[in-house]
């Protein structure tokens, strides 16, 4: 909350309300929707961001082929239940008592059921594949320059430790960013790859979550990198459990 001190705003999360009634009269910022205090020196968890949002209203040789167990977020927005740390609860239910299990990035990983559905644990998403297509440019970007720029972006803008950016693949016009973070690798204070990916996704869509900062201006050697399509695949430590009906659909 010290990051919020100067003019009582939250640099890392515009979906907050800040007031000078924190400990010692310091600035304190609370997420819309949940009322939970957030640490403005780092990224806010995706679950709290989604809750706040709901309350505010080509096969290439070098590209990764998502595994058969990779999940895509097809369900879109919902008002999630977050745990005391602001993480997704393993079981999510809607207002009509339809329930489902989610992974640590809040993406559904089971068929929908009723209130009797059990989700024994929150399964960690340990591998995220961000698949981007950039707008046509005069020529291809230099791969190593692109790699360096994207790693810099995740390190500086999203505060993600460089070791969690596993690889950057490029075959014009497709860019793939691989984020990997096992439970054992994530230390206290480390930004979660799911949170970093969500901030990046919102930045790419021109919906930056950062307070007062300009939108994302991605440049490689001065050349603007403009993304026209984004697909994100999520791989969990335990494969998802969907019925055959869905798998064959």
């Amino acid at each position: 909350h010290t990051a919020a001190q100067d003019n009582c705003t939250c640099p890392t999360n515009k979906m907050t309300v800040c007031s000078p009634d924190g400990p010692g009269g310091r600035c304190q910022c609370r997420a819309l929707g949940s009322g939970m205090a957030v640490d403005c020196s780092t990224l806010t968890s995706k679950c709290l961001l989604l809750k706040a949002r709901m309350s505010a209203p080509k096969n290439a040789r070098t590209l990764v082929r998502p595994s058969e167990h990779a999940l895509v977020d097809n369900d879109g927005l919902y008002d999630p239940d977050c745990d005391p740390e602001g993480r997704f609860k393993a079981r999510q239910c809607n207002q009509t008592s339809v329930c489902w299990c989610v992974n640590s990035v809040g993406v559904r990983r089971t068929d929908k059921g009723d209130l009797s559905l059990r989700c024994d644990e929150l399964v960690r998403t340990h591998h995220i594949l961000i698949d981007l297509r950039h707008r046509p440019t005069a020529g291809a970007f230099n791969h190593s320059d692109l790699d360096a720029e994207l790693r810099r972006l995740f390190r500086e803008r999203y505060r993600l430790h460089p070791k969690f950016v596993a690889a950057v693949h490029y075959e014009q016009p497709t860019i793939q960013i691989e984020l990997r973070q096992n439970t054992s690798q994530k230390a206290a204070g480390d930004v979660d790859i799911g949170d970093a990916a969500y901030y990046f996704e919102r930045d790419i869509k021109g919906e930056s979550l950062f307070q007062g900062r300009g939108g994302l201006d991605l440049r490689v050697r001065g050349e603007p990198l403009q993304v026209e399509r984004t697909l994100i695949y999520y791989l969990d430590e335990i494969p998802p459990k969907f019925s055959m009906k869905r798998l064959t659909a």
């Epitope: 909350h1 009582c8 309300v17 007031s19 000078p20 009634d21 924190g22 400990p23 304190q28 609370r30 819309l32 949940s34 009322g35 939970m36 205090a37 640490d39 005391p84």
Partner: antibody, heavy 116, light 111 residues
Framework: QVQLVQSGAEVKKPGASVKVSCKAS????????IGWVRQAPGQGLEWIGD????????NYNEKFKGRATLTADTSASTAYMELSSLRSEDTAVYYC?????????WGQGTLVTVSS | DIVMTQSPDSLAVSLGERATINCRAS??????????MHWYQQKPGQPPKLLIK???NLESGVPDRFSGSGSGTDFTLTISSLQAEDVAVYYC?????????FGQGTKLEIK
């Protein structure tokens, strides 16, 4: 000095609505949350919800959602709590307080009596 | 919702003696930096008065015989030397997440 002054006592019939006001002075009204708490006779404190006058943001206790409406008039530095579809169990003293949790200044309270 | 449970419900302590009131939250209300727990005193016919904010921060103007401690789920309000004017009902409240619930109250009397 900081002061929160609430409107006077009200007697209402079941099914009616009541609107309690809370006029703030001595601080920048738009910078702090205003919380609303009620206390039934001889009972403990119950949190209703809060409002941030600077943006009109509100939070509600699920128990009161749909029945309680919190609003604020920044030009008058006044917060309002309206409770509809009143029933006898809504008879209580209603307080406004400055702050989210750990309200440091409180209004004197407004007794709302619901009786047929 | 987070349930706040105070103990005891009522307490009788001799003047000058120590009074201790406990509050337990149904889940942790602390981060590594702060505990989102507050203590109030309420006398008959008056609004609650904030004594302690964020588990241990004494509010301005509150006598230093009042102190607060604890973290996680277990918190304590201590009055080191009870005075006659301390007779009141004491409430704990969390501000961890919506709704910001209160404990049921502890009535403190003179023995």
């Amino acid at each position: 000095q900081v002061q929160l002054v609430q409107s006077g006592a009200e007697v209402k019939k079941p099914g009616a609505s009541v609107k309690v006001s809370c006029k703030a002075s001595g601080y920048t009204f738009t910078n702090y949350w205003i919380g609303w708490v009620r206390q039934a006779p001889g009972q403990g404190l119950e949190w209703i919800g809060d409002i941030y006058p600077g943006g009109g943001y509100t939070n509600y206790n699920e128990k009161f959602k749909g029945r309680a409406t919190l609003t604020a008039d920044t030009s008058a530095s006044t917060a309002y709590m309206e409770l509809s579809s009143l029933r006898s169990e809504d008879t209580a003293v209603y307080y406004c307080a400055r702050g989210t949790g750990g309200g440091d200044y409180w209004g004197q309270g407004t007794l709302v009596t619901v009786s047929s | 919702d987070i349930v706040m449970t105070q103990s005891p419900d009522s307490l009788a302590v001799s003047l000058g003696e120590r009074a201790t009131i406990n509050c337990r939250a149904s889940q942790s209300v602390s981060t590594s930096s702060y505990s989102y727990m507050h203590w109030y005193q309420q006398k008959p016919g008056q609004p609650p008065k904030l004594l302690i904010k964020y588990a241990s921060n004494l509010e301005s103007g509150v006598p230093d015989r009042f102190s607060g401690s604890g973290s996680g789920t277990d918190f304590t309000l201590t009055i080191s030397s009870l005075q006659a004017e301390d007779v009141a009902v004491y409430y704990c409240q969390h501000s961890w997440e919506i709704p910001y619930t209160f404990g049921q109250g502890t009535k403190l009397e003179i023995k």
